[in-house]
Amino acid sequence: NKILVKQSPMLVAYDNAVNLSCKYSYNLFSREFRASLHKGLDSAVEVCVVYGNYSQQLQVYSKTGFNCDGKLGNESVTFYLQNLYVNQTDIYFCKIEVMYPPPYLDNEKSNGTIIHVKGKHLCPSPLFPGPSKP
């Protein structure tokens, strides 16, 4: 049995920040679980991890230098990424693992979310203002 994951197909990160919600076909509240977000088609970079245990506080961390936070719903985990760079535009995949109680469960690979990071562009004032009306 595999858990199904739903993600938005695409998100635009204005102001270099984005909320990515991973929706699962599974209630996480009475489980020990590890939810993670992975970058790239090969999911090579583990961007952020949310570790949950029903009796303890949520642990959120990144071992790859991303600024992230996480929030738990009963069938979802939302990753909040900040300080993203334009060159971190990529496809991001949600992963979920239920560690306890047994048996171990994980998800079918999702379609992923393309996060398009738009850098902050300041609009310069025009050098030559248009002709003034008399």
Partner: antibody, heavy 121, light 107 residues
Framework: QVQLQQSGAELKKPGASVKVSCKAS????????IHWIKLRSGQGLEWIGW????????QYNAQFKGKATLTADKSSSTVYMELTGLTPEDSAVYFC??????????????WGQGTLVTVSA | DIQMTQSPSSLSASVGDRVTITCKTN??????LAWYQQKDGKSPQLLIY???HLVEGVPSRFSGSGSGTQYSLTISSLQPEDFGNYYC?????????FGGGTKLEIK
């Protein structure tokens, strides 16, 4: 279909031990937790503990630690509960039940028929 | 440990009556609750899981409701075959305690 077949009734003397068996069929034995429950005459259901044959994980109710020991034999798809140092208070019907995971919510949809253990001098 | 307080402990009702049994917990169990029916000498039968989900094959007169720390099982129109004992059980960690039970007798 899923079946849990328990061993027959037992009559034991105080201080003795008893081993109750629960033979599973109709599913992959190592993929499901088996719970054990006690029912004393005129009283309610008491949860004893669970055993996961896939990894031999066990959880006991603190009240039954030192009283009940859960084990399994994968080759025969059987889970066992041994009760030691029997007293008249251990006289009860003991049930095994399979835990199913309903998308993150647990319940016990499949039960054995029960094993009556009587402790009497 | 989670404490389960089930009430009433016994109940006598007539065929056709609407009956409600309640189960209270000392902390939020997030709907990780099941209801069982047990008749004398028989194994318990699962009626409801996840507080509100009716098991396939169980008559629709049975329903579960509640959230947080308060849950209930309702039989909308009592039938003669509904006599017996009813138990709630939580699955919010271990021990997976049962409620004390409700003995339902038909008048």
């Amino acid at each position: 279909q899923v079946q849990l077949q328990q061993s027959g009734a037992e009559l034991k003397k105080p201080g003795a031990s008893v081993k109750v068996s629960c033979k599973a069929s109709g599913y992959t034995f190592t993929e499901y937790i088996i719970h054990w429950i006690k029912l004393r005459s005129g009283q309610g259901l008491e949860w004893i503990g669970w055993f996961y044959p896939g990894s031999n994980d066990i959880q006991y109710n603190a009240q039954f630690k030192g009283k009940a020991t859960l084990t399994a034999d994968k080759s025969s798809s059987t889970v066992y509960m041994e009760l030691t140092g029997l007293t008249p208070e251990d006289s009860a019907v003991y049930f095994c039940a399979r835990r199913d995971d309903f998308s993150g919510y647990d319940a016990l949809p499949y039960w054995g028929q029960g094993t009556l253990v009587t402790v009497s001098a | 440990d989670i404490q389960m307080t089930q009430s009433p402990s016994s109940l006598s009702a007539s065929v056709g009556d609407r009956v409600t049994i309640t189960c209270k917990t000392n902390e939020n169990i997030y709907s990780n609750l099941a209801w069982y029916q047990q008749k004398d000498g028989k194994s318990p039968q699962l009626l409801i899981y996840a507080a509100t989900h009716l098991v396939e094959g169980v008559p629709s007169r049975f329903s579960g409701s509640g959230s947080g720390t308060q849950y209930s099982l309702t039989i909308s129109s009592l039938q003669p075959e509904d006599f017996g004992n009813y138990y709630c059980q939580h699955f919010w960690g271990t021990p997976c305690t049962f409620g004390g039970g409700t003995k339902l007798e038909i008048k």
